[in-house]
């Protein structure tokens, strides 16, 4: 169970694959696409709001927590929309919903090598967000050796060192990068 209903912290970050392709979102009221693609040189990277929650460490899960606790995250590309795991379809979807969020929106955060992370479904341990055919999908990882397989590894980073922000009032934040410094406190996220 998740301890408390409020996140312990929130960060705004770009999400890219192990091979440095960007995760991008094209979102309308009634439809969306999630792409894994190389961006143009002048194109800004999409950001996701990562909300970190502390959870009790269940015995059948292997999160990177301490003292019997682990970190879970939700990922939001814009206000009121969150990534969801659809375990039946093995797909990663965007859903508009209100809090409290369903379990399908929570992912156990694993800190991996080379400043990479992976996202394990709270609702289906052993199943991770991964990349398949230039789209996000749910990928079953059979053994701990496969936890380092490249297609489930992601980077929360940017070339701009001031890109990761600790979010203040993130739910109302929709402005551009130029104004970000005035809305956020710079915060380094250590893996």
């Amino acid at each position: 169970s998740i301890t408390g209903i409020s996140p312990i912290t929130e960060y705004l970050a770009s999400l890219s694959t192990y091979n440095d392709q960007s995760i991008t979102f094209a979102l309308e009221d009634e439809s969306y696409e999630i792409y894994v693609e190389d961006l143009k040189k002048d194109e800004k990277k999409d950001k996701v709001l990562l909300s970190y929650y502390e959870s009790q460490h269940p015995s059948n899960e292997s999160g990177d927590g301490v003292d019997g606790k682990m970190l879970m995250v939700t990922l939001s590309p814009t206000k009121d929309f969150w990534l969801h795991a659809n375990n039946k379809e093995h797909s990663v979807e965007l859903h508009k919903c209100e809090k409290p969020l369903p379990d399908q929106a929570f992912f156990v955060l694993h800190n991996m090598h080379s400043n990479c992370v992976s996202f394990e479904c709270k609702t289906d341990p052993g199943v991770f967000i991964g990349v398949k055919d230039n789209h996000l999908a749910l990928i079953k990882v059979d053994s701990s050796e496969n936890l380092c397989t490249e297609n489930i590894l992601f980077k929360l980073s940017e070339t701009n060192p001031a890109f990761l922000y600790k979010v203040v009032g993130a739910a109302d934040y929709k402005d551009d990068d130029d104004k970000a410094a005035h809305h956020h406190h710079h915060h380094h996220h250590h893996h």
């Epitope: 979102l27 009221d29 040189k41 814009t78 929709k174 402005d175 551009d176 104004k179």
Partner: antibody, heavy 126, light 106 residues
Framework: EVQLLESGGGLVQPGGSLRLSCAAS????????MSWVRQAPGKGLEWVSA????????YYADSVKGRFTISRDNSKNTLYLQMNSLRAEDTAVYYC????????WGGGLRYPFGYWGQGTMVTVSS | LPVLTQPPSVSVSPGQKASITCSGE??????AAWYQQKPGQSPILVIY???KRPSGIPERFSGSNSGNTATLTISGTQDMDEADYYC?????????FGGGTKVTVL
């Protein structure tokens, strides 16, 4: 169905003011950045101004900076353009346009104009 | 800001291919969009992100963008494609349009 309906155009003398409105329907207005684009008679398209979904960020072409003010009322699903110190060269059809996609966190301006209104004519002449 | 240069006019016979160029410094580093405007009507988005077509836009419309030139191609041009076409990019949160190209179907 997405609909954008401009109003407020008309004839105004040089140095005068005009306020354009764009009533939006058929989508979640506050989620999208909006722009004003104008077209002088027989000429091409010129981007004028834009505003983020929340209204917290505004952007202007150099040709109107300091004279025009873009704003929005998300409770009324309406976009505005306050035009002051009007000049003859501001004569044009003014279109409001919606971004193709919902603005993301820290999005700035980068999406194409997916939907356009029918335009309202502004004539600046003495 | 980049200046986007388009040919003022392009003529094409029905069923033939029409290519409209849009030139600007480092054009290939940005995403280009293309709009179609018929007389007395509002513009319509026909290509975005260089190559993608919005729903409802016929497959005969395609786009490319590299180097300093973006190109809109209409293959198998029809009479209904006669219109003005404008390219557009964003540069530092400023919208920039090309001067427009009038496509005439002979």
């Amino acid at each position: 169905e997405v609909q954008l309906l401009e109003s407020g155009g008309g004839l105004v003398q040089p140095g005068g003011s005009l306020r354009l409105s764009c009533a939006a329907s058929g989508f979640t207005f506050s989620s999208y950045a909006m722009s004003w684009v104008r077209q002088a008679p027989g000429k091409g398209l010129e981007w004028v101004s834009a505003i983020s979904g929340s209204g917290g960020s505004t952007y202007y072409a150099d040709s109107v900076k300091g004279r025009f003010t873009i704003s929005r009322d998300n409770s009324k699903n309406t976009l505005y353009l306050q035009m002051n110190s009007l000049r003859a060269e501001d004569t044009a059809v003014y279109y409001c346009a919606r971004d193709l996609w919902i603005q993301l966190w820290g999005g700035g301006l980068r999406y194409p104009f997916g939907y356009w209104g029918q335009g309202t004519m502004v004539t600046v002449s003495s | 800001l980049p200046v986007l240069t388009q040919p003022p006019s392009v003529s094409v016979s029905p069923g033939q291919k029409a290519s409209i160029t849009c030139s600007g410094e480092r054009m290939g580093d940005k995403y280009a969009a293309w709009y179609q405007q018929k007389p007395g009507q509002s513009p319509i988005l026909v290509i975005y992100q260089d190559t993608k077509r919005p729903s409802g836009i016929p497959e005969r419309f395609s786009g490319s963008n590299s180097g300093n030139t973006a190109t809109l191609t209409i293959s198998g041009t029809q009479d209904m494609d006669e219109a003005d076409y404008y390219c557009q990019v964003w540069d530092s949160s400023t919208g920039v349009f090309g001067g427009g190209t009038k496509v005439t179907v002979l």
